[in-house]
């Protein structure tokens, strides 16, 4: 058992001229708070999976109001550390997500409004009991500086918090075969109580005679590395010869979820859905109050001022679960009709409609020409979700209300002159050319390159385009 501790040093604009404006204003004062989510580092969980190692929410920072005209400084931070207790062994490799949230303190109806300013993530190797590790990360235009460490809670010691220490029974030295507990030299390592032969590096125990494996190891003594790449089944126990996991009991057999939690298998392990008042990998963390920040993803915690009274998380749109830890796949209900594309934006659901359909759920079939009149004898053509008028000769525009200038496009070739006419246009061709658009040269001997001009028209006459 132990505690992961996170210290936020600064949150402010990154360097360079494109620094962001302050997230708070005189009209909308605000304050910051942070959330950290921890997962075992080598688990191949989805990004939205619960924070299996735990999570914590900081206190709110001081209220900040932007000074007009001043560049955004590093913003005032909440006091203290974010602490995430862990009950089992510290995994050594862990993933983290740190979110910076803004709480707006203006005149919101229904209380303050929250918005996510920045989110950083990473995977790191970290031994419990080691020094503070520092990090600098950018997220959008913001820069976050922080430190973190994992420390064991007595009597646990060691890089995974799996060794136990006890006060010395004799003042001068430890018992036979027992070493002093560094750095607590006045304490001694507790007698080995794990199953005989249990790997000291990869195994640990919480009860006498047991041998539980750290992530990545298997076998009765935790001496076999898990290698699933060449294995057919993702289940244990292990075949000691191959290091592969061979078919065996499923991860939910015997229900590892405590306190009435329900277990569901995941590709590599299991996931517990905890009842209200409990959380953690196995629903083992209890006595949670709102002060512990149990509501994830911006959920609002209500009640639970003391460990005996349960809290309730009011989840923002798009999240559910007793701790708002589960993302709702609202698009799986196929709310968009008529082939519309569903977009879950977190705060809202949007449907992108196919041509010819409209409405919040694409429920309206657009009769493109309904109520649409095309003027001057034009006819309406449906298509593409918008009406189009096919206009009578001499008219144009969206509704055929504009009188077309048939000569605007300079339709007469070879220097022919264009005249607007009630039925269209007329080209007066230059000498040597003929045709409706003066497109054909007249041969020198008087014969044209095409059949003779229509009766009654000489090759040099204006050709009327009907």
């Amino acid at each position: 058992a132990g505690v992961f501790e996170l210290q936020i040093h600064s949150f402010g604009p990154g360097p360079g001229p494109g620094a962001p404006r302050s997230p708070c204003s005189a009209r909308l004062p605000c304050r910051l708070f942070f959330r950290v989510c921890l997962k075992p580092g080598l688990s191949e969980e989805a990004a939205e999976s619960p924070c299996a190692l735990g999570a914590a929410l900081s206190a709110r920072g001081p209220v900040y109001t932007e000074q007009p005209g001043a560049p955004a400084p590093d913003l005032p931070l909440p006091d203290g550390l974010l602490q995430v207790p862990f009950r089992d062994a510290w995994p050594g490799t862990f993933s983290f997500i740190i979110e910076t949230w803004r709480e707006e303190l203006g005149d919101q109806i229904g209380g303050p409004a929250w918005s996510l300013l920045a989110r950083v993530a990473g995977r790191r190797r970290l031994a419990a009991g080691g020094p503070w590790a520092r990090d600098i990360q950018r997220a959008g235009a913001w820069e976050l500086r922080f430190s973190y460490r994992a420390r064991c809670e007595p009597p646990a010691v060691g890089t995974a918090c799996t060794r136990l220490c006890r006060p010395r029974s004799a003042p001068s030295r430890c018992g036979p075969g027992l070493r002093p507990c560094a750095p607590l030299e006045d304490e001694c390592e507790a007698p080995l109580v794990c199953r005989a032969g249990c790997s000291p590096e990869h195994g640990f125990c919480e009860q006498p005679g047991e041998c539980r494996c750290l992530e990545g190891w298997t076998g009765p003594l935790c001496t076999v590395p898990v290698s699933t790449s060449s294995c057919l089944s993702p289940r244990g126990p292990s075949s000691a010869t191959t290091g592969c996991l061979v078919p065996g009991p499923g991860p939910c057999d015997g229900n590892p979820c405590a306190n009435g939690g329900s277990c569901s298998e995941t590709p590599r392990s299991f996931e517990c859905t905890c009842p209200r008042g409990f959380y953690g990998l196995r629903c083992e963390v209890s006595g949670v109050t709102c002060a512990d920040g149990p509501c994830f993803n911006g959920g609002l915690c209500v009640g639970g001022a003391d460990p005996d009274s349960a809290y309730i998380c009011h989840c923002p749109p798009g999240f559910q679960g007793s701790n708002c830890e589960k993302r709702v796949d609202r698009c799986s209900l196929q709310p968009c009709r008529n082939g519309g594309l569903c977009l879950d934006l977190g705060h809202a659901l949007r449907c992108r409609c196919r041509a010819g359909f409209a409405g919040p759920r694409c429920e309206h079939d657009l009769d493109d020409c309904a109520g649409r009149a095309c003027a001057n004898g034009g006819t309406c053509v449906e298509g593409g979700g918008a009406h189009r008028c096919s206009c009578a000769l001499g008219f144009g525009g969206r509704d055929c209300r504009e009188r077309a200038d048939p000569c605007a496009a300079r339709p007469c070739a070879h220097g022919g002159r264009c005249y607007a006419h009630f039925s269209g246009l007329v080209c007066a061709c230059a000498p040597g050319y003929m045709g409706a658009r003066c497109e054909f040269p007249v041969h020198p001997d008087g014969a044209s390159a095409l059949p003779a001009a229509p009766p009654g028209l000489r090759p040099g006459d204006p050709q009327r385009y009907l």
């Epitope: 990004a47 520092r134 990360q137």
Partner: antibody, heavy 117, light 107 residues
Framework: QVQLVQSGAEVKKPGASVKVSCKAS????????IHWIRQAPGQGLEWMGY????????EFNQNFKDRVTMTRDTSTSTVYMELSSLRSEDTAVYYC??????????WGQGTTVTVSS | AIQLTQSPSSLSASVGDRVTITCRAS??????LAWYQQKPGKAPKLLIY???SLEDGVPSRFSGSGSGTDFTLTISSLQPEDFATYFC?????????FGGGTKLEIK
Amino acid sequence: QVQLVQSGAEVKKPGASVKVSCKASGYTHTRYWIHWIRQAPGQGLEWMGYINPTTVYTEFNQNFKDRVTMTRDTSTSTVYMELSSLRSEDTAVYYCARGGSNFFDYWGQGTTVTVSS
Amino acid sequence: AIQLTQSPSSLSASVGDRVTITCRASENIYYNLAWYQQKPGKAPKLLIYTANSLEDGVPSRFSGSGSGTDFTLTISSLQPEDFATYFCKQAYDVPPTFGGGTKLEIK
């Protein structure tokens, strides 16, 4: 403006060591880490490690862990990277870069190190 | 270490073209991906960080998108100075690793 200026080209024999410097200017040099990245001829980029000039904490790529040392001189805002037990495959351009864990925003001009007998 | 696979490894295009380069990570790296441009004999230059944030001073014709394992760098309208090699880099895990590069050449 921010500048990282590296030392000149080096030619070394196999088994020797090389020490490349990177002088920072235009910003408070303890505010960001200095990373070292190398690029063999015609190849991609390979991260070697970084030093935090404030704490002198270093973290290295396992491929170089036993051969690389990174130090700093606060008085001159200079960071040094020393690579020992050189082999021919260490022939590369060595870059220093300013940054944090998820960005390298300014780079030095590069130092060519040639390892040849 | 996390592997990054860039495609294509080389690409010929003309000034004014829209160009897309992709980078695929061997596992989920959230949005911890950066894009760098490198010209012959020069140091790489940061273009995009955290998948879609444009570094100061980089023209807006460059844009990045994606999260998880699949990422894209798009140049909306190629300019003569954009012909270079482009690298993606993941910063989710230590050690940071780079893609193999995409060489963008004039057609």
